[in-house]
């Protein structure tokens, strides 16, 4: 600033007479940066951190307050200070946060509240990482809190990280929390969900498990087809292609119920496209939807496939003809 000492001079500047802060209050908003540096005691600031948030300090005044705390706690802030950081949290770097030991869910909530409505910043990601590692696992209360603030949080974790989610935590997951999950993540989450919801009755179970089905194997889809679940097309389109391919026409018809008519609109998209190509034309014709497969209508041979990612492209490129 042109009208104040340079940073190197700030610490050497004495507090003007009568300006020494006795408490953290609104009068401090009129202090220049160098006056805050000279007149506010760091220990006083630390004990009255809860007041900082209630006072509309400017961006640059908050820089000074952070600097004072950094000097007071070079090894990292204690949780009593962290809990009351408020908007000062936005000034913390991931390096600052790595020095913290945050154990209280209330502290985590308070800091996430500050960042509410914004994308997950590197600071928040670091904070969550520190918190979860400190707890040893992603328990239900933590997951509840994190997905409330960041619906996409689960899908930002690697399959390895997701493996530490206990099945009991799955109860906190809402369908929208899984919107951006890829198949590898759902492969990890699905068995946990299956375990978590295993004691529910058929229709309730399907409502809960539905958003996890992108990780379900063929045998579970076959089992669901026997339960009149009426899966919608949006859910069907998210199923693993390798899990859908072995299903018979009858099983898919039972699985989808009245939604089976939607297959026609999706016939060019995976996994419907690839599943159609694997069916006998006679069987497809029973649906009365005009779906065109490429298999003959005679003997039904089940060929073994490696369900790798190249399979769909082979089907599409070569339009494999099936022979006896």
């Amino acid at each position: 600033d042109a009208a104040q000492p340079a940073a190197s001079e700030v610490e050497k500047t004495a507090c003007p007479s009568g300006k020494k802060a006795r408490e953290i209050d609104e009068s401090l908003i009129f202090y220049k940066k160098w006056e805050l540096e000279a007149c506010v005691d760091a220990a006083l600031l630390a004990t009255q951190m809860d007041r900082v948030n209630a006072i509309p300090f400017t961006y640059e005044q908050l820089d000074v307050l952070k600097h004072k705390l950094d000097e007071l706690y070079p090894q990292g802030y204690p949780e009593s200070v962290i809990q009351h950081l408020g908007y000062l949290f936005l000034k913390m770097s991931p390096e600052d946060i790595r020095k913290w030991n945050v154990t209280s869910l209330e502290t985590l909530k308070a800091l996430l509240e500050v960042n509410k409505g914004h994308e997950m910043s590197p600071q928040v990601a670091t904070l969550i990482d520190r918190f979860v590692k400190g707890r040893g696992q992603l328990d239900k209360d933590t997951l509840d809190t994190l997905t409330a603030f960041y619906p996409g949080y689960l899908c930002s974790l690697s399959p390895e990280e997701l493996s530490s989610v206990p099945p009991s935590s799955i109860w906190a997951v809402r369908p929208q929390d899984l919107d951006t999950c890829d198949p590898r993540q759902l492969d990890v989450l699905y068995p946990k969900a299956r375990l978590a919801f295993q004691n529910m009755n058929g229709s309730e179970y399907f409502v809960k498990i539905q958003s996890f089905l992108g990780g379900a194997p063929t045998e579970d889809l076959k089992a669901l087809s026997q339960q009149n679940v009426s899966m919608d097309l949006a859910t069907f389109m998210k199923l693993r292609t390798d899990a859908v391919l072995p299903l018979t026409v009858a099983e898919v018809q039972k699985l989808l119920g009245p939604h089976v008519e939607g297959l026609k609109a999706e016939e060019r998209h995976r996994p419907v496209r690839d599943w159609i190509l694997r069916q006998r034309q006679d069987d497809l014709d029973t649906l009365g939807l005009g779906l065109q497969g490429t298999r003959g209508s005679h003997h039904h041979h089940h060929h073994e496939f490696r369900h790798d990612s190249g399979l769909n492209d082979i089907f599409e490129a070569q339009k494999i003809e099936w022979h006896e």
Epitope: D1, A2, A3, D25, E26, I29, F30, K32, N53, A54, I55, P56, F57, T58, Y59, E60, Q61, L62, Y87, L88, L90, K91, V114
Partner: antibody, heavy 122, light 107 residues
Framework: QVQLQQSGAEVKKPGASVKVSCKAS????????MHWVRQAPGQGLEWMGI????????TYAQKFQGRLTMTRDTSTSTVYMELSSLRSEDTAVYYC???????????????WGQGTLVTVSS | DIQLTQSPSTLSASVGDRVTITCRAS??????LAWYQQKPGKAPKLLIY???SLASGVPSRFSGSGSGAEFTLTISSLQPDDFATYYC?????????FGGGTKVDIK
């Protein structure tokens, strides 16, 4: 949508006091600081002070210290600005304007009341 | 207190003109500067914040630039609705202060 609805015009005698209200709606009242800004006829804008609706903390520009009082009623999401010892130069349109509670990088006024004309005349 | 000086104080222009208004601060205000538009009998309306960020719902013909002590508001092609008075405001430090205003009228 966000609305700041101010009370009607006032005519006051020199030495009297005036109390202007500003009722907020369409957002979480306690998440935004409320400021008062005035504008004398044909003149520019002048910042008067601020109230934090959450805790009731107030800060006034030095020029108005001792004459200005800001209060709030969270039950009705209303803030009040009272200016005492009025003189003719206090004739102005008084605006309430909100600023989001943030890390200091957002202290611009994103919503304003419609303004209240206060005329001080003997 | 930080003084903000706007120039020119009055500007006559025609529809379609490119208009530039300057705001100078008496000391460094970093990027903590906003611009407002005010029409007669109305409250000011936020146009630009943080020196160059366009407020929600504001047409893209408005733009802001600058940092430190010198800032500009530019209207790339003046429209009939743009004839008004424009104010800058700093929020680097308290008290918050405004420039004296620039009135844009029809040539």
């Amino acid at each position: 949508q966000v609305q700041l609805q101010q009370s009607g015009a006032e005519v006051k005698k020199p030495g009297a006091s005036v109390k202007v209200s500003c009722k907020a709606s369409g957002y979480t009242f306690t998440n935004y600081y409320m400021h008062w800004v005035r504008q004398a006829p044909g003149q520019g804008l002048e910042w008067m002070g601020i109230i934090n609706p959450s805790g009731g903390y107030t800060t006034y520009a030095q020029k108005f210290q001792g004459r200005l009082t800001m209060t709030r009623d969270t039950s009705t999401s209303t803030v009040y600005m009272e200016l005492s010892s009025l003189r003719s130069e206090d004739t102005a349109v008084y605006y309430c304007a909100r600023i989001r509670s943030c890390g200091g990088d957002c202290y611009y006024f994103d919503n304003w009341g419609q303004g209240t004309l206060v005329t001080v005349s003997s | 207190d930080i003084q903000l000086t706007q120039s020119p104080s009055t500007l006559s222009a025609s529809v379609g003109d490119r208009v530039t208004i300057t705001c100078r601060a008496s000391e460094n205000v970093n990027i903590w500067l906003a611009w407002y538009q005010q029409k007669p009998g109305k409250a000011p309306k936020l146009l630009i914040y943080k020196s160059s960020s366009l407020a929600s719902g504001v047409p893209s013909r408005f733009s802001g630039s600058g940092s430190g002590a010198e800032f500009t508001l530019t209207i790339s092609s003046l429209q009939p609705d743009d004839f008004a008075t424009y104010y800058c405001q700093q929020y680097q430090s308290y008290p918050l202060t405004f420039g004296g205003g620039t009135k844009v009228d029809i040539k």
